[in-house]
Amino acid sequence: TRDVREPPALKYGIVLDAGSSHTSMFIYKWPADKENDTGIVGQHSSCDVPGGGISSYADNPSGASQSLVGCLEQALQDVPKERHAGTPLYLGATAGMRLLNLTNPEASTSVLMAVTHTLTQYPFDFRGARILSGQEEGVFGWVTANYLLENFIKYGWVGRWFRPRKGTLGAMDLGGASTQITFETTSPAEDRASEVQLHLYGQHYRVYTHSFLCYGRDQVLQRLLASALQTHGFHPCWPRGFSTQVLLGDVYQSPCTMAQRPQNFNSSARVSLSGSSDPHLCRDLVSGLFSFSSCPFSRCSFNGVFQPPVAGNFVAFSAFFYTVDFLRTSMGLPVATLQQLEAAAVNVCNQTWAQLQARVPGQRARLADYCAGAMFVQQLLSRGYGFDERAFGGVIFQKKAADTAVGWALGYMLNLTNLIPADPPGLRKGTDFS
């Protein structure tokens, strides 16, 4: 017989990502004896909560908490029983709840209270349900991407930790109700609200971040729908042959479409709207989402928001990935350059509903929105953020890194559980358990 060293015990953490359109649960794990190492935390499992985001339960807060039960029950199975009590559980809500908090703070509080009540019933170490600021959402997404890609520090073969010279990656997140851009910058921000100073593993990072509320995919689609109703009476971004009944109350209930809301409208009225497969009119409609008329700083992205020039490589995730992946995979179109991305958007916008359905079978009506989505992504990156062909060459569209979803959830947990120390790690001896 010989002594066999047991693998180290694992620790777990749970984050509920309460997005505007749906909630996802992520369970993370890491070896208990390597808590301060980098790149050591990975995704153990995930679960998609059925139904809409928690903000859609404004009139039924208990429904929000009830919707989480299936995934929480899965968490009881996925995390070993003896680890339940020591497993931190967080819920972070993003732009959907930020919007609800703007229009109906009481409903927003009620939803969070109902959710909190349910989460405390479980044997995990519940550490709160709260609404993240746009800045937090952006920064935690940036932390996640760079942590997973080991851009902060690495463990060298000589037994020392060192900072890789490749620098950090910028992060771009396109959610349902907001979009975030975050990247490391050398010069101080002209707008202090857009700058975050981070100390990670003994290194100092100056990070630019901005979150654009109402510029998430779903809200953009609603705004385009409102514009189409207002100016055309048809939808240039929808495919010809596609038509649907639009409930005006659904279109104008969001604060994002408030500016387009007619003075007197019947919220229960339905309007029939048809697509026209018109890429040029669609481009014009999307252009109307961005304002470049005034900039109180030396330079801006759009809507008078300060932004330094984009620098370095970027990872674009969530709906950025899904949109570009649809063009690349489902439509078989090249998207390696900005020019190709624009051509791909035009290609999709030229398709009739019959052509689109035949190319991409078995899809829900959401298929009709890929033209607008592609046109928006192309314009946001090129005109909005100012990516030129050279800079766009450094953008990778990714859903996962190291088998872990890229998004704010991991960065949030790493921060709240102090899994990324501010101080540099000391010299460590590794133990091989293989």
Epitope: D48, A358, G362, Q363, R364
Partner: antibody, heavy 120, light 108 residues
């Protein structure tokens, strides 16, 4: 009433190719697509690829990429599936299935299939 | 890559209700299709778009889909319902149709 009629059973040697045809009788390929699905003995269904003849659009499952070619002749309303570099694991019943716009391009009409046996 | 998981077999007493599940990540966001295949025959579409029946399919067949699970329900099961049942969905990420492994339904 559209029916699909496939070519007859084939016995092939490893390394060779097979080309199976599928003719739509009583209708055309206008607005339809055709998928090829295979089923090894005692196994489940496996999608190989599809063609939208009126768009000239083809898609293949990654597993068969480079080994399968799907074509269609609109004038005769016939679709073809050619599988090359055959190996014993390719022994299966090969079905062609019509994808209909009325069913969101899922498979609403199937033929009885063509048995392809790969044996040395 | 996207996978659909079905139980290998399901048994139901004659006249009772059979439920066959099909699980996959966020399958509720996709449309699910169900096919019935009897020995030596080609598959037949019994449910499309989650819960719709093609003409000629009895009302006893119904479907549902939400979250991570789609379900085919066969009420008042008959001996003639004995067959293999496959769920299918289109995987947008890889531009391909995906079939579940199939479930053998036995009517006792």
């Amino acid at each position: 009433q559209v029916q699909l009629v496939q070519s007859g059973a084939e016995v092939k040697k490893p390394g060779s190719s097979v080309k199976v045809s599928c003719k739509a009788s009583g209708g055309t390929f206008d607005s339809y697509a055709v998928s090829w699905v295979r089923q090894a003995p005692g196994q489940g269904l496996e999608w190989m690829g599809r063609i939208v003849p009126w768009l000239g659009h083809t898609q293949y499952a990654q597993k068969f990429q480079g080994r399968v070619t799907i074509t269609a002749d609109e004038s005769t309303s016939t679709a073809y599936m050619e599988l090359s570099s055959l190996r014993s694991e390719d022994t299966a019943v090969y079905y062609c299935a019509r994808e209909s716009p009325g069913y969101r391009y899922s498979f609403d009409v199937w033929d009885q299939g063509t048995l392809v046996t790969v044996s040395s | 890559s996207y996978e659909l998981t079905q139980p290998l077999s399901v048994s139901v007493a004659l006249g009772q209700t059979a439920r066959i599940t099909c699980s996959g990540d966020a399958i509720g966001e996709k449309y699910v299709y169900w096919y019935q295949q009897k020995p030596g025959q080609a598959p037949v579409l019994v449910i499309y778009d989650d819960n719709n029946r093609p003409s000629g399919i009895p009302e006893r067949f119904s479907g549902s889909n939400s979250g991570n699970t789609a379900t085919l329900t066969i009420s008042r099961a008959q001996a003639g319902d004995e067959a293999d049942y496959y769920c299918a969905s289109y995987d947008l990420q890889q531009a391909r149709w995906v079939f579940g492994g199939g479930t053998k339904l036995t009517v006792l």
